[in-house]
C-alpha cells in the first residue's frame, strides 16, 4: 500500500486570533482627523481631532495638551476666541474637516465645519521631545470675506482634502472640497483651489485660483475627494465622482487630478480616469472580458516601492507608486469576486499618460471629436479649443486650460482576489528592506500587514490582528510616526509597529524563522517571539525537526517495517535529499535505517500546503520488547538552508511493537488449479507495512487484511500434494507449522 502523509494547510502554521495589545489613546469622541509631526530635534507629536476638541499627544500617545475647537459660540472655544469678539456665525459643533501640517513654519492648521469653514494656525513649539501648540491664530479677516467671495472659507462640511506646498517663502494650500447647492451658497467654498497663506497669518490671500462645479450641476454632480498628496512637481487629488454629467449620477468612477506644485495656477489642471479590475486567472462564464471592474476608490496611499515589487511592476526600485483600494460600488458589496481589490499605479506612468493626453488634445493635426471634458467645471469644448470657445485665439495656448485626458489608466488587482471578503477601509504602504508592505485597516477593526507582491496565489502576511474589542471600522487616514503607524478606530488611536506587532502568531519554528528579517522573529523553545520577549532561549539560526505523524503505528517485533514519518523541518531542500549520517531515527531502542527518496514519487507541493516525508526501514533489535514506545528523529550536521539549519530532536509517542500470531488456517485443501479463498486467523496480522502468505513458496494473493484475519487466493499447485504454508510479516516468518493440500480439480 502507498500511504501518504496528510497535507498540512499553510494556514496551520499561523494563528490570527492571537491577541496583540498595541499602545492606544482614547480621544473621548469619534476620531475625525489625525496627523503626526517629527521635528529635526528628535521632538514629535500626534495631533488628534474629535468634535469640538484637538488633542496633542506625545510619541508615547500620552496627552500633552488639549484645545477646545468648539462649539462655535461657546465662550470656552479657544479657537473661536482667537477670532476676536463674536458672533462670527451660527453657533454649532465643530467637526474637524482639515488637519494638516504646514512644514515651512512648522505649524498645525485645523479647519472645521463651523464658522464658514475657516482655519486656525497653531505654531508648533518643541520642548524636549514633546511638542506644544502655541495659542491659535484665526486665519480669517472679516473685511476680506463675503458670502460670494471668501478666500478664508476653506473647509466644506461635506469633506475637504488639503495638501500644503512650500513655494519660495510662501505656503500654498491645495484645497479640494465636496460641494452641494446648500454648501456652495454659503460663503462660496470652491471645489479645487490654491490659496496662499498670508505672511501675517491673518488668513489667505484674496484673488486665489479655483475651479468649482457649475451651479447647474451642483444638485446632481457630487465629487468626493478621497485622498491628496504631493510628489515631485505635482499635487494630486483622488476623487470618486459620476462617470458622466448627463448620465446616471450613481454610476461612479475614480479619477486622479493633477495640479502643478511649482506654479499656483490651474491652467495645467489635468484629470485621468483610474480603472482597477479583478481579473481571475480562470475566467468564469459570463464574467466580463478584461476582468470585473471595481470603479470606486475607497482609500489610497502613495509610496516608493521595494526591489521585488518594482521588478514585478517593471519600474525602478524606490519609484513612487500610487496604491488604491477599490470596491464595486458605494456600499462596497459585490456580487461575485472579492470585496476589495488593490491596484498599483506608478506615478511616472500616470504623468506620462497625462502628458501624452495633453499632446493629443493640443497637437496638430487636430484629432476630430476629442473633447476637453470636465464639463462640470467648465463650458464644453473640443480640443484644442479653450472651454466654451469655438477656436483658439492667437494669444491663448491650448495647454493652459483644464483637461480630462481621454484615455483611462487600467490596472488589475495585485492580490488576485485573495482579499476575499475583507473590506479594506485604511491603507498605508511602506518599504521595509527590499519588501513593500501594505498596512491595511478593515471594516471589522483589524489590521492586515501584507507583502505587496503579484506573483503568488496566497497572501504573505506580516500580521493579521484585531486592534481592540470594539470591532469598529478602521478609519481612512493613517499617519506615520517613526517606526509606527497610527490608525484610528472609533474613539481610539492605535500605534502599530511597521515591523508588525510581534511574532506570536507564527506557530512553527520554520514559519517563525522564515519570517521577514525586519520582523525580528526568533524561536524561544516552543514559541515565536522577539528577543525582548524571551532573551534566554531566543535564537534565529536553527529549528528542530517536527514530527506530526507516522505510519504505520505498529510493527512486528521480528521483521522489518517501512516507516513513513510526517512533519516539517526534515530537509530544508525541496529535493528532500539527505546527506549521509545527518538523520537518525530510533523506535524504542531500535534503529530505523533512512531510505533514499524514490524520485518517481516526488510530487510538487503547492506552497499553500506543506508536509515533509521521511522513510526508513525499521529492524527491531533482539533486545527490543513488545509494547508501546516512542519514535524519535534526530537531525544533526545538516548544511544550513536559506533561512536556518535543521538541528535537534523530535519525539512522538504511539508506536507499538507486536508479535503476530497465526491461530488457524482454513480450508486446508483446495483444487490444484488454485483460487481457493484461504482464511488465516490470528492476532496482530496487520502490523507493519508488508506481509505475505506463501503456499509452497509461492505468494497467495492477499484480498483482505485486518488485525485478526487475512484472506488470500491460493496460487496454482504443480502437483496434487500437501505443501508447506507460511505467513511472513515484515519478511520474518510467523511461528507455526501449517500445510495445504492440493487436490485434483
Amino acid at each position: 500500500e502507498d500511504w501518504q502523509c496528510p497535507r498540512t494547510p499553510y494556514a496551520a502554521s499561523r494563528d490570527f486570533d492571537v491577541k496583540y495589545v498595541v499602545p492606544s489613546f482614547s480621544a473621548g469622541g469619534l476620531v475625525q482627523a489625525m496627523v503626526t509631526y517629527e521635528g529635526d530635534r528628535n521632538e514629535s507629536a500626534v495631533f488628534v481631532a474629535i468634535r469640538n476638541r484637538l488633542h496633542v499627544l506625545g510619541p508615547d500617545l500620552k496627552s500633552v495638551q488639549s484645545l477646545a475647537t468648539g462649539p462655535a459660540g461657546d465662550p470656552g472655544c479657544q479657537t473661536c476666541a482667537a477670532c476676536g469678539p463674536g458672533p462670527h456665525g451660527p453657533p454649532g459643533d465643530t467637526d474637524t474637516k482639515v488637519l494638516v501640517l504646514d512644514p515651512a513654519l512648522p505649524a498645525l492648521v485645523s479647519c472645521g465645519s463651523s464658522l464658514q469653514g475657516r482655519c486656525f494656525l497653531h505654531d508648533l513649539e518643541p520642548q524636549g521631545t514633546a511638542v506644544h501648540l502655541a495659542a491659535p491664530a484665526c486665519l480669517f479677516s472679516a473685511h476680506h470675506n463675503r458670502p460670494d467671495d471668501c478666500p478664508d472659507c476653506v473647509a466644506s462640511p461635506l469633506g475637504t482634502r488639503v495638501t500644503v506646498v512650500e513655494q519660495g517663502q510662501a505656503s500654498y494650500f491645495y484645497v479640494a472640497s465636496s460641494l452641494d447647492a446648500a454648501v456652495a451658497a454659503s460663503f462660496s467654498p470652491r471645489s479645487v483651489s490654491i490659496r496662499r497663506l498670508k505672511a501675517d497669518a491673518s488668513g489667505f490671500a484674496p484673488g486665489f485660483v479655483a475651479l468649482s462645479v457649475l451651479p447647474k450641476h451642483l444638485v446632481s454632480y457630487s465629487i468626493e475627494y478621497v485622498h491628496s498628496f504631493h510628489t515631485g512637481a505635482f499635487v494630486y487629488f483622488l476623487t470618486v465622482q459620476p462617470a458622466s454629467v448627463t448620465d446616471d449620477p450613481s454610476a461612479l468612477h475614480t479619477r486622479l487630478a493633477r495640479l502643478s506644485a511649482t506654479e499656483p495656477e490651474l491652467g495645467d489642471y489635468r484629470e485621468l480616469v483610474l480603472d482597477c479590475r479583478f481579473a481571475p486567472k480562470r475566467r468564469r462564464r459570463g464574467a466580463p472580458e478584461g476582468g470585473q471592474p471595481y470603479p470606486v476608490l475607497r482609500v489610497a496611499h502613495s509610496a516608493p516601492v521595494g526591489a521585488q515589487l518594482a521588478t514585478e511592476l517593471s519600474i525602478a526600485e524606490g519609484q513612487e507608486v500610487l496604491f488604491g483600494v477599490f470596491v464595486t460600488g458605494k456600499d462596497g458589496g459585490p456580487g461575485v469576486g472579492p470585496n476589495s481589490v488593490v491596484c498599483a499605479f506608478p506615478i511616472d506612468l500616470l504623468d506620462t499618460l497625462i502628458d501624452e493626453g495633453v499632446e493629443r488634445c493640443c497637437e496638430s493635426p487636430v484629432h476630430p471629436g476629442l473633447r476637453r471634458g470636465l464639463d462640470f467645471f467648465q463650458s464644453p469644448s473640443f480640443c484644442p479649443n479653450p472651454p466654451g470657445l469655438e477656436a483658439l485665439s492667437p494669444n491663448t495656448s491650448c495647454r493652459h486650460f483644464p483637461l480630462l485626458v481621454s484615455s483611462s489608466f487600467s490596472r488589475v488587482d495585485l492580490f488576485n482576489g485573495l482579499l476575499g471578503p475583507v473590506q479594506v477601509t485604511a491603507l498605508y504602504v511602506t518599504r521595509l528592506d527590499n519588501v513593500t508592505v501594505a498596512h491595511m485597516g478593515t471594516m471589522d477593526g483589524r489590521i492586515l500587514q501584507v507583502e505587496l507582491v503579484r506573483s503568488l496565489n496566497y497572501l504573505l502576511y506580516v500580521s493579521n490582528f484585531s486592534l481592540g474589542d470594539s470591532g469598529q471600522p478602521v478609519q481612512r487616514d493613517v499617519s506615520r510616526l517613526g517606526d509606527h503607524l497610527l490608525f484610528a478606530s472609533g474613539d481610539q488611536v492605535f500605534q502599530v509597529p511597521i515591523q508588525g506587532p510581534g511574532c506570536r502568531h507564527f506557530l512553527t519554528c520554520g514559519r517563525c524563522l522564515r519570517a521577514w528579517h525586519f520582523m525580528g522573529c526568533g524561536w524561544c523553545g516552543n514559541m515565536c517571539g522577539q528577543q525582548k520577549e524571551c532573551p534566554g532561549s531566543w535564537q534565529q539560526d536553527h529549528c528542530p525537526p517536527k514530527l506530526t505523524e507516522f505510519h504505520p503505528h505498529s510493527g512486528p517485533l521480528r521483521g522489518s517495517t517501512r516507516l513513513t514519518l510526517c512533519g516539517s523541518n526534515f530537509y530544508l531542500h525541496p529535493s528532500g535529499l539527505v546527506p549521509e549520517g545527518t538523520h537518525q531515527v530510533t523506535v524504542g531502542q531500535s534503529p530505523c535505517r533512512p531510505l533514499p527518496k524514490d524520485s518517481s514519487k516526488l510530487r510538487p507541493v503547492p506552497r499553500k500546503d506543506f508536509v515533509e516525508e521521511f522513510e526508513c526501514e525499521l529492524e527491531p533489535l533482539g533486545t527490543q520488547a513488545v509494547g508501546p514506545t516512542n519514535v524519535s528523529l534526530t537531525v544533526t550536521n545538516m548544511p544550513p538552508g536559506k533561512h536556518f539549519r535543521v538541528d535537534g530532536t523530535s519525539v512522538l509517542r504511539g508506536f507499538s511493537f507486536m508479535e503476530p500470531v497465526l491461530i488457524a488456517v482454513q480450508p486446508l485443501f483446495g483444487p490444484r488449479a488454485g483460487g481457493t479463498c484461504l482464511t488465516l486467523e490470528g492476532q496482530s496480522l496487520s502490523v507493519g507495512t508488508s506481509r505475505a502468505v506463501l503456499v509452497n513458496g509461492t505468494e497467495c494473493l492477499l484480498a483482505r487484511v485486518s488485525e485478526g484475519q487475512l484472506l488470500c487466493a491460493t496460487p496454482p499447485g504443480a502437483t496434487v500434494a500437501s505443501v508447506p504454508l507460511s505467513l511472513q510479516v515484515g519478511g520474518a516468518q510467523v511461528p507455526g507449522s501449517w500445510t495445504f493440500q492440493y487436490r485434483e480439480d
Partner: antibody, heavy 117, light 108 residues
Framework: QVQLVESGGGLVQPGGSLRLSCAAS????????MSWVRQAPGKGLEWVSY????????YYADSVKGRFTISRDNSKNTLYLQMNSLRAEDTAVYYC??????????WGQGTLVTVSS | DIVLTQSPATLSLSPGERATLSCRAS???????LGWYQQKPGQAPRLLIY???NRATGVPARFSGSGSGTDFTLTISSLEPEDFATYYC?????????FGQGTKVEIK
C-alpha cells in the same frame, strides 16, 4: 541657566514711543512662546501681549491694541515690544516671560516705563 | 474676557498654618490652562503651579493646586516664612489672557 533681561525702559512723554527689548539666553528661544506682562506701581499683574515661537500668532490686551506691537528675532534670541502713543496709564514695570501652555515659567527682572510730562 | 476673582484679598496667618487661596473664573476654564504665580515685593513673579495642579520645577511640595471648571484653589499646607507674598492666578485659555487681582498672604 535660563535668563531673560529686559531693557529700553525710561521716562517718556505722553504720546511718545519706546521700544523694549528682552534678551534671552540659556534655552532654545525659537521653541517658546513669549509674553509681556506689566505691573503698575502698587497694582496687580496685567498681561500685555503674546507672540508664538515663530511669530505666526500675536495677541494684545484690549488696553494696548493698535498702539503696541510685539515682535521677535529668533536669530538674535530677542523679544521686542514697540510702544507708541504712550499714555500715563501705561506707566508700569514691564516684564518679559517665557512659555504659554505650561505657564510662564521664567521671567525677567523687569524694566520701568514712566509716562509723564 | 474671562474675569478671575481671587479671595480673600488678604490672608493673615502664622508660619506653620495652612493657607487656602481661591480663584473663581467668570466662565469655565480648562484646567490645562490655569496657573498660579507668587510675587514678593521688588521681585519678578515666579510660576508655582501650571495646569491647575502641576508643581513647576523647584517648587516645594507644600504648594498644591486643585480645582476645575470655574473654581480653583491653591493650598500651602504649612506656611514657611518665605511664603509670605502675593499670589496671582492666571488663565491662558481664551484671549485676552488674564490675571486675578491677587491675594496677599501676610504674617499675622
Amino acid at each position: 541657566q535660563v535668563q531673560l533681561v529686559e531693557s529700553g525702559g525710561g521716562l517718556v512723554q505722553p504720546g511718545g514711543s519706546l521700544r523694549l527689548s528682552c534678551a534671552a539666553s540659556g534655552f532654545t528661544f525659537n521653541s517658546y512662546s513669549m509674553s509681556w506682562v506689566r505691573q503698575a506701581p502698587g497694582k496687580g499683574l496685567e498681561w500685555v501681549s503674546y507672540i508664538s515661537s515663530r511669530s505666526s500668532t500675536t495677541y494684545y490686551a484690549d488696553s494696548v491694541k493698535g498702539r503696541f506691537t510685539i515682535s521677535r528675532d529668533n536669530s538674535k534670541n530677542t523679544l521686542y515690544l514697540q510702544m507708541n502713543s504712550l499714555r500715563a496709564e501705561d506707566t508700569a514695570v514691564y516684564y518679559c516671560a517665557r512659555g504659554y501652555f505650561h505657564g510662564m515659567d521664567y521671567w525677567g527682572q523687569g524694566t520701568l516705563v514712566t509716562v509723564s510730562s | 474676557d474671562i474675569v478671575l476673582t481671587q479671595s480673600p484679598a488678604t490672608l493673615s496667618l502664622s508660619p506653620g498654618e495652612r493657607a487656602t487661596l481661591s480663584c473663581r473664573a467668570s466662565q469655565s476654564v480648562s484646567f490645562d490652562y490655569l496657573g498660579w504665580y507668587q510675587q514678593k515685593p521688588g521681585q519678578a513673579p515666579r510660576l508655582l503651579i501650571y495646569g491647575a495642579s502641576n508643581r513647576a520645577t523647584g517648587v516645594p511640595a507644600r504648594f498644591s493646586g486643585s480645582g476645575s471648571g470655574t473654581d480653583f484653589t491653591l493650598t500651602i499646607s504649612s506656611l514657611e516664612p518665605e511664603d509670605f507674598a502675593t499670589y496671582y492666578c492666571f488663565q491662558a485659555l481664551i484671549m485676552p489672557f488674564t490675571f486675578g487681582q491677587g491675594t496677599k498672604v501676610e504674617i499675622k
